[in-house]
Amino acid sequence: SIPWNLERIIPAWHQTEEDRSPDGSSQVEVYLLDTSIQGAHREIEGRVTITDFNSVPEEDGTRFHRQASKCDSHGTHLAGVVSGRDAGVAKGTSLHSLRVLNCQGKGTVSGTLIGLEFIRKSQLIQPSGPLVVLLPLAGGYSRILNAACRHLARTGVVLVAAAGNFRDDACLYSPASAPEVITVGATNAQDQPVTLGTLGTNFGRCVDLFAPGKDIIGASSDCSTCFMSQSGTSQAAAHVAGIVARMLSREPTLTLAELRQRLIHFSTKDVINMAWFPEDQQVLTPNLVATLPPSTHETGGQLLCRTVWSAHSGPTRTATATARCAPEEELLSCSSFSRSGRRRGDWIEAIGGQQVCKALNAFGGEGVYAVARCCLVPRANCSIHNTPAARAGLETHVHCHQKDHVLTGCSFHWEVEDLSVRRQPALRSRRQPGQCVGHQAASVYASCCHAPGLECKIKEHGISGPSEQVTVACEAGWTLTGCNVLPGASLTLGAYSVDNLCVARVHDTARADRTSGEATVAAAICCRSRPSAKASWVQHHHHHH
Amino acid sequence: QDEDGDYEELMLALPSQEDGLADEAAHVATATFRRCSKEAWRLPGTYIVVLMEETQRLQIEQTAHRLQTRAARRGYVIKVLHIFYDLFPGFLVKMSSDLLGLALKLPHVEYIEEDSFVFAQ
């Protein structure tokens, strides 16, 4: 007897299970930055501390009438979604409310910053258990709001934010665009993106995942026993904040990077109809609906990876795009993608002590994306091996020459602008296992890692006939770490990873010109982490149609 | 995101107005002014002055005080509404936009962001 949204995010085996904190561990605390709330509501009574924090702008209009039930509506509902007894995700969680939104649901960047600072001060004065901060609000892109979120996240606080209800790119809004924040879009009971009047959920590369956000039943501030449904990315974010609270109550030492990776890994995949999003955003938007993951005790030892897209480089001739992993993650591979196919490849370089994935636009190109594969590899030692471009049409190759290091990804970067002279590079494992091979005028980069029990293999899939894309998936138990396109006769747009699927994209116009003998190949590097085993290279599998 | 998307960044390296302060005249503004790309969401007159990451507590207060002093010399009253110590060094100030050029030239200033609205989602 549970509402659709809870049924969707809490798998059957979790529904009766209580997430109790281990003995002696501190309780998870959720901080809600929103409107005022009705703390006496039956759903949340005894679970909520209404702090004395209040930093809101004046309401608009001279005749505005402050009605408590209206002032409390948004915050009360969200508090109920997080920790409500009947309709909450994390029923036992204690919640602290900070008022940063006025009775009209309006706040300021400065008020939100002061609220975040209040949380930091509370943390310094009285260190407690894990903290989750729910930010069910959005404004225009703000460098300082994003920076404040970054600073707070680096103290171990987990921030969850609404993607925004503007049917727009979430990267244009804050705190949704802050990389350190878990940004949540909204889906409905049919797992489709939420429409809200003429607008709807935000989307794009700054969204980490989606969660229920349409017709969500929760506490209503009309009375202490009233319930109502509300819709929006706030409700979606509240679901994820509740999931995170439950994860942390079971395992208080989980880090932000682990939480995000587990949320992504255990989410329901490929149920969202991507056609709802603008065409240029479809590839950037995650097709993921949140579910409560099992504990690491039940699923330990898995290699977890996610795909991080850069911002678009822009069309200038030397425009570059940069994709970064979180500090705790390893950058296991870097690829690039351009809608026009005019790109000069990708590479990994160190900036400020951190490896980043870079992609370069080509003359006449409309711009590129850098696509990083970011993974959690315990006790990893990773390095990049680079071979500069060879002269006179010779191929360039590079392999992992350090003992016990395995190849996790290849990158290729062309020195020349002329797309006609180059044959795009290849990852030719048939010649030598664990080797990246490029053709003339290409610099080749191999990502090599050593970690206990890490083993990898290459899996290829080629299609000779006309096709806009070629895909290859890693089988169950293996995780995709690298994805490249090995071209046939046609111009390739690039390659990227979608969950465990390597997607190689081919230029539409080239399809008619194809000769059947020249297959375009998607090449995936699939890795797994076997506990208490040596790192090893497994001979690849390839298969062509 | 790393790049500042749909976001206004304005370089206000305005010529120093003489007020007899050598250090002010010598300090060229490398700091930037930022504001929300959506005009209706802007709150002109309230600014978040963000200082360099390593700025010490005392320097934050000194910078805010220095801005007040220099503004007063020009006949402007400014109000420091909040000082940020714990998450980032900076302060929130209510002042005329006429003073932005002056504020950007203060030592330790990394950028100034005009306050803007956020909304329940």
Epitope: R85, D222, C223, T225, F227 | -
Partner: antibody, heavy 117, light 107 residues
Framework: EVKLVESEGGLVQPGSSMKLSCTAS????????MAWVRQVPEKGLEWVAN????????SYLDSLKSRFIISRDNAKNILYLQMSSLKSEDTATYYC??????????WGQGTSVTVSS | DIVMTQSHKFMSTSFGDRVSITCKAS??????LAWYQQKPGHSPKLLIF???YRYTGVPDRFTGSGSGTDFTFTISSVQAEDLAVYYC?????????FGGGTKLEIK
């Protein structure tokens, strides 16, 4: 499966006392408000009392406040209704119910209490 | 106490018909209203809570609407198994109070 089982009622003299109990199973008892509702044969439903999660807060029908006490034992998953100074108008079928979304979503099978000399 | 009034003690209908039962509160109860079905010899069964939310497992021919003081419970196409007594109940403020009930019968 959620189950609420009321204890046997019975015939009692006017002025006497009786304690009803309701044993809950199939859900986390301490997570729910619980209530008693009664129904006079061939008549409508009348709410009697409810109790919050930990027993620290109770509400009653005004006319019954002085004679009826609702309580709970979360360790044993049992809800009680202590009735004293019983009157003939207390004759009814007594239902124990679980409250969810402030409505009563699960009901026991009911137990018949007859107050008569 | 809030008084709940179901103006019709009985309502006659035919199978397949649409039928609506009304309930009026003596004061504003927002949307804090539930509807129950009781068949002879059985305990009441929750159908609708918070005026318009169908409880889990309840067929979608049952709907509720209204807020404030006036509420309606509708069965879009009456089935044989729907013949029962229907009660409204406010959960806005204690003591919770029920309407007198409306018995649905076949013409």
């Amino acid at each position: 499966e959620v189950k609420l089982v009321e204890s046997e009622g019975g015939l009692v003299q006017p002025g006497s006392s009786m304690k009803l109990s309701c044993t809950a199973s199939g859900f986390t008892f301490s997570d729910y408000y619980m209530a008693w509702v009664r129904q006079v044969p061939e008549k409508g439903l009348e709410w009697v009392a409810n109790i919050n999660y930990d027993g620290s807060n109770t509400s009653y029908l005004d006319s019954l406040k002085s004679r009826f006490i609702i309580s709970r034992d979360n360790a044993k998953n049992i809800l009680y209704l202590q009735m004293s100074s019983l009157k003939s108008e207390d004759t009814a079928t007594y239902y124990c119910a679980r409250e969810k979304f402030a409505a009563m979503d699960y009901w026991g099978q009911g137990t018949s209490v007859t107050v008569s000399s | 106490d809030i008084v709940m009034t179901q103006s019709h003690k009985f309502m006659s209908t035919s199978f397949g018909d649409r039928v609506s039962i009304t309930c009026k509160a003596s004061q504003d109860v927002s949307n804090a209203l539930a509807w129950y079905q009781q068949k002879p010899g059985h305990s009441p069964k929750l159908l609708i809570f918070s005026a318009s939310y169908r409880y889990t497992g309840v067929p979608d021919r049952f709907t509720g609407s209204g807020s404030g003081t006036d509420f309606t419970f509708t069965i879009s196409s009456v089935q044989a198994e729907d013949l029962a007594v229907y009660y409204c109940q406010q959960h806005y403020s204690t003591p919770w109070t029920f309407g007198g009930g409306t018995k649905l019968e076949i013409k």
